[in-house]
Interface confidence: medium
């Protein structure tokens, strides 16, 4: 018996060939011997089967002795043995229809689980193997689960259903809703304007929800909500903003925030959350702000940084075009009785300068100038 695998919702063509290459009488029946369709001369006739409107044939092939049964919009319950009667012969074809669906929605938040469920006809024992867009293979039976979805899981999942050495392939498009970056860090000199950007890693026709930026300043004992906003069809509207600092927010995507100026008391880390309409859970992006200040008080030249710096970072004070006078893996460095000239404070990571602030030290009879 020939086995044909079909996909739910698709169209399948079951073949039936006569030895004579001409139009002769044929009938297609199901396992209950109920007539599905056949011919009377050059006319197509349909029987009382439940397939009725979904069953068809190709009259153009009859003259060549081919009498296919076409079933449109396949259903799992269409799985059956179909019999073609032609020239006193019976050709049997076993049709097995499978369906593969994603749980609830194909748009899932980062960190959520994806469950793929296989619908299969009774008596079948298929195996399923799915390949994620990043090449990860998952195997299973009736259900396949992937926990903690990551951004790289966005895209087309290709799933192969294997039954009786035959296979059928499903493609499911999964969109992982996430920010492009899980975390970002901004380095600024004191007084500079700060731009925070929160680009999304997906595009959808309509995007509605609400968000908030909570900020934990390094100097503060508790975190504080800096801004709350609404998102309606990709348009951003601010609901509430703190008075100090007064953040400005762009009206369009990507989400964009401007901090009027970098100050030591603002240095720290924030968490932007975005709750999307009709989704449980929230998207998160961490943002960090490191602020540098260089000052000269009397005979002491000091450079300090505030905010979440890694222990690998090096803070240095050097006179322009000279070797570093002081270099430490600390958040503050200083030079006593600095000589006159343009001093540079540098925050660097493995030789790469992340932040630089210049301060001019005048001869001892004058006061310092900050460029």
């Amino acid at each position: 018996k020939k086995v044909v695998l079909g996909k739910k919702g698709d169209t399948v063509e079951l073949t039936c060939t006569a030895s004579q290459k001409k139009s002769i009488q044929f009938h297609w029946k199901n396992s209950n011997q109920i007539k599905i369709l056949g011919n009377q001369g050059s006319f197509l006739t349909k029987g009382p089967s439940k397939l009725n409107d979904r069953a068809d044939s190709r009259r153009s092939l009859w003259d060549q002795g081919n009498f296919p049964l076409i079933i449109k919009n396949l259903k799992i319950e269409d799985s059956d043995t179909y019999i073609c009667e032609v020239e006193d012969q019976k050709e049997e074809v076993q049709l097995l229809v499978f369906g593969l669906t994603a749980n609830s929605d194909t748009h899932l938040l980062q960190g959520q689980s994806l469950t793929l469920t296989l619908e299969s006809p009774p008596g079948s024992s298929p195996s399923v193997q799915c390949r994620s867009p990043r090449g990860k293979n998952i195997q299973g039976g009736k259900t396949l689960s992937v926990s903690q979805l990551e951004l790289q899981d966005s895209g087309t999942w290709t799933c192969t259903v294997l039954q009786n050495q035959k296979k059928v392939e499903f493609k499911i498009d999964i969109v992982v809703l996430a920010f492009q970056k899980a975390s970002s860090i901004v380095y600024k000199k004191e007084g500079e304007q700060v731009e925070f950007s929160f680009p999304l890693a997906f595009t959808v026709e309509k995007l509605t929800g609400s968000g908030e930026l909570w900020w934990q300043a390094e100097r503060a004992s508790s975190s504080k909500s800096w801004i709350t906003f609404d998102l309606k069809n990709k348009e951003v509207s601010v609901k509430r903003v703190t008075q100090d600092p007064k953040l400005q927010m762009g009206k369009k995507l990507p989400l964009h925030l401007t901090l009027p100026q970098a100050l030591p008391q603002y240095a720290g880390s924030g968490n932007l959350t975005l709750a999307l309409e009709a989704k449980t859970g929230k998207l998160h992006q961490e943002v960090n702000l490191v602020v540098m200040r260089a000052t000269q008080l009397q005979k002491n030249l000091t450079c300090e940084v505030w905010g979440p710096t890694s222990p690998k970072l090096m803070l240095s004070l050097k006179l322009e075009n000279k070797e570093a006078k002081v270099s430490k893996r600390e958040k503050a460095v200083w030079v006593l009785n600095p000589e006159a000239g343009m001093w540079q404070c540098l925050l660097s990571d493995s030789g790469q300068v992340l932040l630089e602030s210049n301060i001019k030290v005048l001869p001892t009879w004058s006061t310092p100038v900050q460029p």
Epitope: G191, V241, Q243, D244, P260, Q261, A262
Partner: antibody, heavy 118, light 111 residues
Framework: QVQLVQSGPELKKPGASVKVSCKAS????????IHWVKQATGQGLEWIGE????????YSNAKFKDRVTMTADKSSNTAYMELSSLTSDDTAVYFC???????????WGQGTLVTVSS | DIVLTQSPASLAVSLGQRATITCKAG??????????MNWYQQKPGQPPKLLIY???NLESGIPARFSGSGSGTDFTLNIHPVEENDAATYYC?????????FGQGTKLEIK
Amino acid sequence: QVQLVQSGPELKKPGASVKVSCKASGYTFTDYVIHWVKQATGQGLEWIGEIYPGSGSAYSNAKFKDRVTMTADKSSNTAYMELSSLTSDDTAVYFCARRGNGTGFAYWGQGTLVTVSS
Amino acid sequence: DIVLTQSPASLAVSLGQRATITCKAGQSVDYDGDSYMNWYQQKPGQPPKLLIYVASNLESGIPARFSGSGSGTDFTLNIHPVEENDAATYYCQQSYKDPLTFGQGTKLEIK
């Protein structure tokens, strides 16, 4: 201690501009926002706007938006508020103010009287 | 803009008695457990003086005779016992949302 000292009284003609200064001392000037508040004679208080001295970013009340310019000079620790196209309605005392540790204005300048008269 | 309505416009209170001034906001000024309402005292020829911030916090150096209460849209400033020196105009001010706004003021007279 924190001090905000404002410039002296001004007499201006309608249509002219006035620039009021506010010199800060006793704290790091760039660390705090400077606000400007108007008080017409015998009237209540009206917020004009604010400036972040470090970056020069300023935000103003829509009522004054087209006529007010707020600036700050870090070298002299001074904030300025300039009001243009003056009318008699602008006759008032103008205050600069700074927040304390809370959300209220804990420090105020002594006020600058601006009189607009032909 | 958030409109703040103070009442009464003026009041006369006997020395040692309680003075109560109310301020009603056109919308709630509460957020995350705090009420963004401040109170000031102003005497003629002087700048305003901060008394209370975040509805009920006493500014340092202000005597405990001054107290603030309320949340949402309704706020109260109490002075008890009233002293001669308390004769002034009192203003409420919201720091919840731009533009920052003040009440129209309440003039306190001591009898």
